[in-house]
Interface confidence: medium
């Protein structure tokens, strides 16, 4: 628990009058249907809510959609469906907001049978005004935005051709035909893949990995035998079927395809999977699937290199392809990840790291819960989250665990006490230094989400009946008031803050129904008044985070460094505001072996912390191989973990061997690489 | 010996709301969920809900959902079965069951169900105007 | 809901003959799943759990096996007090549900 608190309650005044006086409600003028919404840009108060009908005819599916447009964070919203000519607009690719406060917009209009291409409605002043754009296709995707160039975007047409545009959607030029996947990459590159032999099912694994840097201009195949592509941090990855058989491994390139190595991890089969689970530009979570249809898999984590995997976790619950995982990285602190497990008996479990995968623990019991009947011991048990794949069995779960980066230490999640995750209606727990420690929240399932970085904690209970209120917490969901927003209660839809949660305002979603009419409503809470003063330096404590035993002088140290972070108080009734950065300060520590993973050819024998050699690499299932220059296969056996940045201490020195003689790979030699032009 | 021993047998008006109890010996009543569980006369069994008696938790079929409410005194080892509204269709035979469940499971090989094992002698409600 | 389902609605056995009883899901239940026996009057009892282990005092003429979808529960020879209705449930996703049953009458 953060340090310096006031246990006691510190009740808001008059918060009543102060929330009435900043509701907003508007009632859209429409039938129920389904409602999507934006916020475009950041701290612009501006958001975009599409509102489409369906009704279903005999032979076609005629709809109607609204939009409509707020700048004062949904206080207010004004139609403007006629700046879209009322055309009906497809829900399926939603709205694509552009990248930063660039202010575009782009719509996909839905458009009768028999016509040439698709139609898009584009904004470049955050959604003032449309231009209406015909297009030469008819789009399968959403449009794309390159993250470099706002003004480039890429789209899939159902023909399977990459169409490209440069001038922001207004004109557009296909630069490849058979393609099945295409992503952008850093610097503008667009990364795509293709097939030779009639479609992408078809041809998977014998796809080609294609890069362009020129938006079309000239093209480079940078892999063949393809199963799939991904991007993630630095690093692109490609699955790869052996010549042999029908297994398939994982290349790695960090130089945009020009050359590959193969990352040692397993190879999977036709009905296995991997799975990127987070990345940055430091390293990789991968997940490699189990054969068999088991539910599970082994988490690895890399090196720097994203070549080199250390096995982080076995039996990680992760159902199919594209299926269900409980995978979270916790943002509001460094290093600290959880997920579930499928444990023998097949109950799941939950699990957390705090050092980016190097160690898995289960959570520590909220202090003050019982252990539930699922547990054996009612004296010992953890916390278990519920997240995707309790949300995807129906669980009465409504929230996957939310954190932020700005709200440092707190995560909130659904939960239940004992030994495994439980069928019984959750409770609602939040941890204020990033999962080590927990505490009940809320009884019974909740919406919920973060304001001003954390100086608000607005919650909705989980109800089948209408409602009409809100509850919301000044001290990181110590205590609780309610406040009544409605006289009449609304079927309750969702909530929406803005991305960031540096926001003061909260809408509350929803919609009325009488006997012959449904409308969609929001009321939109400003709580700017509960908060009346801006925070001093008074009202901030600091907190060591990670810290175990302030005793000992490591303590705190997670990937080489510590870190003090200013922290608001609890009991500090105040506002962080708009503009509030996280202040923190880094301390380096001492190395010890742990920072430090083995390299390719070594191994860590159980319990202990030195890298030993592995005897004989040559046809082992790891093997792996390194194109490029003879000095990268030179180890001592010991590579700094990715992102460690500990000095001094500990420093692993050994003799240097040569790994080549060891390594083995057939994949993309250099002359199996070719160039081509438009 | 482990028994559950459920309240005696109900007539009911359409309209009203019945309370059931069940009382549980002979183990430790927060070590297990219990079940509730109905039969219509000639009818199969029909699963109501679940209470998990550490903090009173429960989940119901979605059939019930508004009309049941299950609840549990650990001070007299008892759990109670509410449902509201009653009509004609409700008159049935209600049972309490020990069910060491409750966890949410996962892939292909559970081995963690081991079935409600000690059930009560059942509850007779008859509902009828 | 996962829905399950019985076959036969009613099986007719002499006393001393096998009787094979079954019981599908409309969708994977793992091993979760359990057989009860009913008899006029009475509560249900637990035969199996796990879809395959004998519950405590169950007599070893009662076995079950499968996994999945498709479960069988065998009576390898018939008593006089075996004759009853027979119901499968799972609970491997909520809501638990039971089988419509199946009668073992007397032939």
């Known amino acids: 628990s953060a340090p310096g608190e006031d246990e006691e309650c510190g009740r808001v005044r008059d918060f009543v009058a102060k929330l009435a006086n900043n509701t907003h409600q508007h009632v859209f003028d429409d039938l129920r249907g389904s409602v999507s919404l934006s916020w475009v840009g950041d701290s612009t108060g501006v958001i975009l809510v599409l509102t489409t009908f369906h009704v279903p005819l005999v032979i076609m599916t005629f709809g109607q959609s609204k939009l409509y447009r707020s700048e004062d964070y949904g206080k207010n919203f004004k139609d403007i469906t006629d700046l879209i000519n009322n055309t009906f607009i497809r829900t399926e690719f939603g709205m694509a907001i552009g990248p930063e406060n660039s202010g575009k917009v782009v719509l996909t209009a839905e458009v009768s049978g028999g016509s040439r291409g698709g139609r898009i409605f584009r904004s470049s002043d955050f959604a003032k005004n449309f231009v209406q754009t015909d297009l030469p296709f008819h789009p399968l995707t959403q449009m794309m935005y390159s993250p470099q160039n706002s003004d480039y975007l890429l789209a899939l047409s159902t023909e399977n051709g990459l169409w490209v545009s440069k001038n922001f959607g207004g004109k557009w030029e296909e630069i490849h035909k058979a393609v099945c996947l295409a992503k952008w990459g850093s610097d503008n590159t667009i990364f795509f893949t293709t097939y030779a032999n009639g479609s992408c099912k078809a041809d998977l694994g014998a796809l080609e990995l294609w890069r362009t840097s020129d938006l079309g201009k000239s093209f480079k195949t940078i892999g063949v035998k393809i199963y799939s592509f991904g991007l993630g941090g630095r690093f692109l990855f490609a699955s790869v079927m052996a010549d042999k058989d029908t297994t398939r491994r994982i290349h790695v390139s960090t130089d945009q395809g020009d050359t590959w190595s193969m990352a040692q991890l397993p190879s999977v089969g036709q009905e296995q999977f991997y799975s990127i689970l987070a990345a940055n530009d430091d390293m990789v979570f991968m997940h490699v699937d189990e054969p068999g249809d088991t539910g599970f898999g082994t988490i690895f984590t890399s090196d720097d290199r994203g070549i080199v995997y250390s096995k982080s976790l076995d039996r990680h619950l992760y159902t199919t392809t594209g299926g269900e995982t409980d995978f979270t990285n916790v943002t509001s602190l460094r290093g600290v990840y959880i997920t579930s497990v499928l444990s023998e008996d097949n109950s799941i479990q939950t699990m957390i790291t705090f050092d980016q995968g190097g160690r898995w623990t289960h959570l520590r019991k909220p202090e003050n819960s019982e252990c539930d009947a699922t547990a054996k011991n009612k004296n010992e048990c953890s916390l278990h989250i519920h997240a995707s794949y309790s949300i995807s069995q129906k669980l009465n779960v409504p929230m996957a665990p939310l954190s932020e980066p700005n709200a440092v230490g707190i995560v909130i999640a659904h939960g239940s006490v004992g030994d495994a995750i439980s069928v019984m209606v959750p409770d609602v727990y939040i941890s204020d230094d990033g999962g080590a420690s927990w505490t009940k929240m809320l009884e019974g399932p909740h919406y919920y989400t973060i304001l001003d970085s954390g100086g608000i904690i607005v919650a909705i209970e989980h109800s089948s009946r209408p409602i009409n209120v809100i509850k919301f917490s000044t001290d990181e969901g110590q205590c609780w008031q309610t406040y009544t927003f409605t006289r009449d209660p609304i079927y309750f839809t969702g909530l929406a803050s803005e991305p960031g949660a540096r926001s003061m305002n909260i809408s509350i979603w929803g919609f009325t129904e009488s006997f012959l009419t449904s409308q969609w409503v929001s009321y939109t809470i400003d709580f700017k008044d509960i908060l009346e003063r801006n925070c001093e330096e008074k009202d901030y404590t600091i907190w060591l985070a990670h810290s175990t035993d302030p005793e000992d002088y490591e303590d705190g140290c997670i990937l080489g460094y510590k870190e003090q972070f200013l922290r608001l108080r609890k009991s500090s009734v105040c506002q962080n505001g708009r503009d509030y950065v996280v202040t923190k300060q880094p301390s380096i520590c001492l190395c010890s072996l742990e920072d430090f993973l083995c390299d390719f050819g070594y191994y860590r024998p159980e319990n202990d912390s030195k890298c030993v050699e592995q005897p004989e690499l040559k046809g082992h299932d790891l093997e792996f191989c390194l194109y490029g220059r003879e000095e990268h296969l030179t180890t001592n056996g010991y590579r700094k973990i990715p992102g460690d940045k500990c000095q001094g201490g500990v420093n692993p020195v050994r003799e240097v061997k040569d790994l080549k003689k060891k390594c083995t790979s057939n994949f993309l030699s250099p002359e199996k690489q070719n160039s081509k032009s438009n | 010996q482990v028994q559950l021993v459920q309240s005696g047998a109900e007539v009911k008006k359409p309209g009203a709301s019945v309370k059931v109890s069940c009382k549980a010996s002979?183990?430790?009543?927060?070590?297990?969920?219990m079940s509730w569980v109905r039969q219509a006369p000639g009818q199969g069994l029909e699963w109501m809900g679940i209470i998990n008696p550490v903090g009173g938790s429960t989940s119901y079929a979605q059939k019930f959902q508004g009309r049941v409410t299950m609840t549990r005194d650990t001070s007299t080892s008892t759990v109670y079965m509410e449902l509201s509204s009653l009509r004609s269709e409700d008159t049935a035979v209600y049972y309490c069951?020990?069910?060491?469940?409750?966890?949410?499971?996962?892939?292909?090989?559970?081995?963690?169900?081991?079935?409600?094992?000690?059930w009560g002698q059942g509850t007779t409600v008859t509902v009828s105007s | 809901e996962i829905v399950m389902t019985q076959s036969p609605a009613t099986l007719s056995v002499s006393p001393g003959e096998r009787a094979t009883l079954s019981c599908r899901a409309s969708?994977?239940?793992?091993?979760?799943l359990a057989w009860y026996q009913q008899k006029p009057g009475q509560a249900p009892r637990l035969l199996i759990y796990?879809?395959?282990t004998r519950a405590t005092g169950i007599p070893a003429r009662f076995s079950g096996s499968g996994s999945g979808t498709e479960f069988t529960l065998t009576i390898s020879s018939l008593q006089s007090e075996d004759f009853a209705v027979y119901y499968c449930q799972q609970a491997r996703l909520g809501p638990w549900t039971f089988g419509g049953g199946t009668k073992v009458e007397i032939k």
């Open positions: 002979g183990y430790t009543f927060t070590s297990r969920y």
């Open positions: 969708q994977s239940v793992s091993s979760n």
């Open positions: 069951a020990r069910d060491p469940s409750g966890i949410a499971a996962a892939g292909p090989a559970s081995r963690y169900y081991y079935g409600m094992d000690v």
């Open positions: 796990g879809a395959s």
